[in-house]
Interface confidence: medium
């Protein structure tokens, strides 16, 4: 699997989408897990409703929510009040029995440009910062990792 990068702004919300083949994964619950190290296990964060037919219902674990459009084939994860410690490698998974298939590998990046709270592009006139209520899900972008970029750089 290629790794897709999703970028969100610190303190705001980030939506991650994981498309999948709805026929191939029919009847399967889904999960969102965090990769612990390059070769470590993927620690479950949140999973869809126990009853597959109710997968469209949003389930929360702390500040992370999951919902599944089983007909359209899109799993959506929302990370609310994004913090620096949320940055890292995650997986969208399709569950069957005790097994899990990886739907998408996701690298979450938490961005923090100090100009983002100023008036648009104008460095010299500070503006009011948007509150979470003003914008429920803020700007997010996704891309594939650049060649040579690694999700787990060597630690010094």
């Amino acid at each position: 699997h290629n790794t897709t990068v999703f970028q969100g702004v610190a303190g705001q919300s980030l939506q991650v989408s994981c498309p999948y083949d709805s026929m191939k994964h029919w009847g399967r619950r889904k999960a969102w897990c965090r990769q612990l190290g390059e070769k470590g296990p993927c620690q479950r964060v949140v999973s869809t409703h126990n009853l597959w037919l109710l997968s469209f219902l949003r389930r929360w674990n702390g500040s992370t929510a999951i919902t599944d459009d089983t007909l359209g084939g899109t799993l959506t994860i929302t990370l609310r009040n994004l913090q620096p410690h949320d940055a890292g490698l995650y997986q969208c998974q399709s569950l069957h029995g005790s097994e899990a298939d990886t739907l998408r590998k996701v690298l979450v990046e938490v961005l923090a440009d100090p100009l983002d709270h100023r008036d648009a592009g104008d460095l010299w006139f500070p503006g009011e910062s948007e509150s979470f209520e003003d914008a429920h899900v803020e700007h997010s972008i996704s891309r594939s990792l650049l060649e040579g970029e690694i999700p787990f750089p060597p630690t010094s």
Epitope: G11, A87, L111, D113, H117, P126, E128, S129, I141, L146
Partner: antibody
Framework: EVQLVETGGSLVQPGKSLRLTCATS????????LHWVRQSPEKHPEWVAH??????????YYAESVKGRFTISRDDSKSSVFLQMNSLKEEDTAIYYC??????WGQGTLVTVSS | DTVLTQAPLSVSVTPGESASISCRSN???????????LYWYLQKPGKSPQLLIY???NLASGVPDRFSGSGSETDFTLKISEVETEDVGVYYC?????????FGPGTKLELK
């Protein structure tokens, strides 16, 4: 005229505490995100901590090297930002700047941690 | 962390000549809304850093237009078209895209 004046720097023994104060004037303090940046002699600046505005619930962020030891806070009514430094180490020795990390910088206050 | 490297670490320039300083990041600094979060500072001897360039190529207020910034996602250049005596000091690149914010090691500019 914009002013940021840092005070509270001194010579202190390892393991002790120190509180830095940054008094500001001349700009809309309550809207501005503020940071502490430090610089050891002949080294490049190092970002230490960051506090956002009231509209961002005064969210705080820290460098790993100071997390759990340093606390950044602000008092909008006094246009001041603070850095409470506990369990100081010799490697914390530096000039500490109060700044919005963009256009506003103080002159710095020297913190020396030595036995 | 996002690591910035600068080259050269020291440069000696004749007044009136141009100078270029390069900064390289180990990660892309292209963020949301196509904003590249790379900043350039000059720190004059005994002074606080002062902002020259913000978001890769925007000249900060009061900075002479002989300074210019350019680059891509990971490679950046600060150019001084005609160096003057007041330009002496240490030039730092910095990234404010990800926590922790990080600065480059600096490039010392001296006059010949």
């Amino acid at each position: 005229e914009v002013q940021l004046v840092e005070t509270g720097g001194s010579l202190v023994q390892p393991g002790k505490s120190l509180r830095l104060t940054c008094a500001t004037s001349g700009f809309p303090f309550s809207n501005v995100w503020l940071h502490w940046v430090r610089q050891s002699p002949e080294k490049h600046p190092e970002w230490v901590a960051h506090i956002k505005a009231k509209s961002d619930n005064y969210a705080t962020y820290y460098a790993e090297s100071v997390k759990g030891r340093f606390t950044i806070s602000r008092d909008d009514s006094k246009s001041s930002v603070f850095l409470q430094m506990n369990s100081l180490k010799e490697e914390d020795t530096a000039i500490y700047y109060c700044t919005d990390i963009l256009e506003y910088w103080g002159q710095g206050t020297l913190v020396t941690v030595s036995s | 962390d996002t690591v910035l490297t600068q080259a050269p670490l020291s440069v000696s320039v004749t007044p009136g000549e141009s100078a270029s300083i390069s900064c390289r990041s180990n990660k892309s600094l292209l963020g949301i809304r196509d904003i590249t979060s790379l900043y350039w500072y000059l720190q004059k001897p005994g002074k606080s850093p002062q902002l020259l360039i913000y978001r890769m190529s925007n000249l900060a207020s009061g900075v002479p237009d002989r300074f210019s910034g350019s680059g891509s996602e990971t490679d950046f250049t600060l150019k001084i078209s005609e160096v003057e005596t007041e330009d002496v000091g240490v030039y730092y690149c910095a990234q404010f895209l990800r926590y922790p914010y990080t600065f480059g090691p600096g490039t010392k500019l001296e006059l010949k």
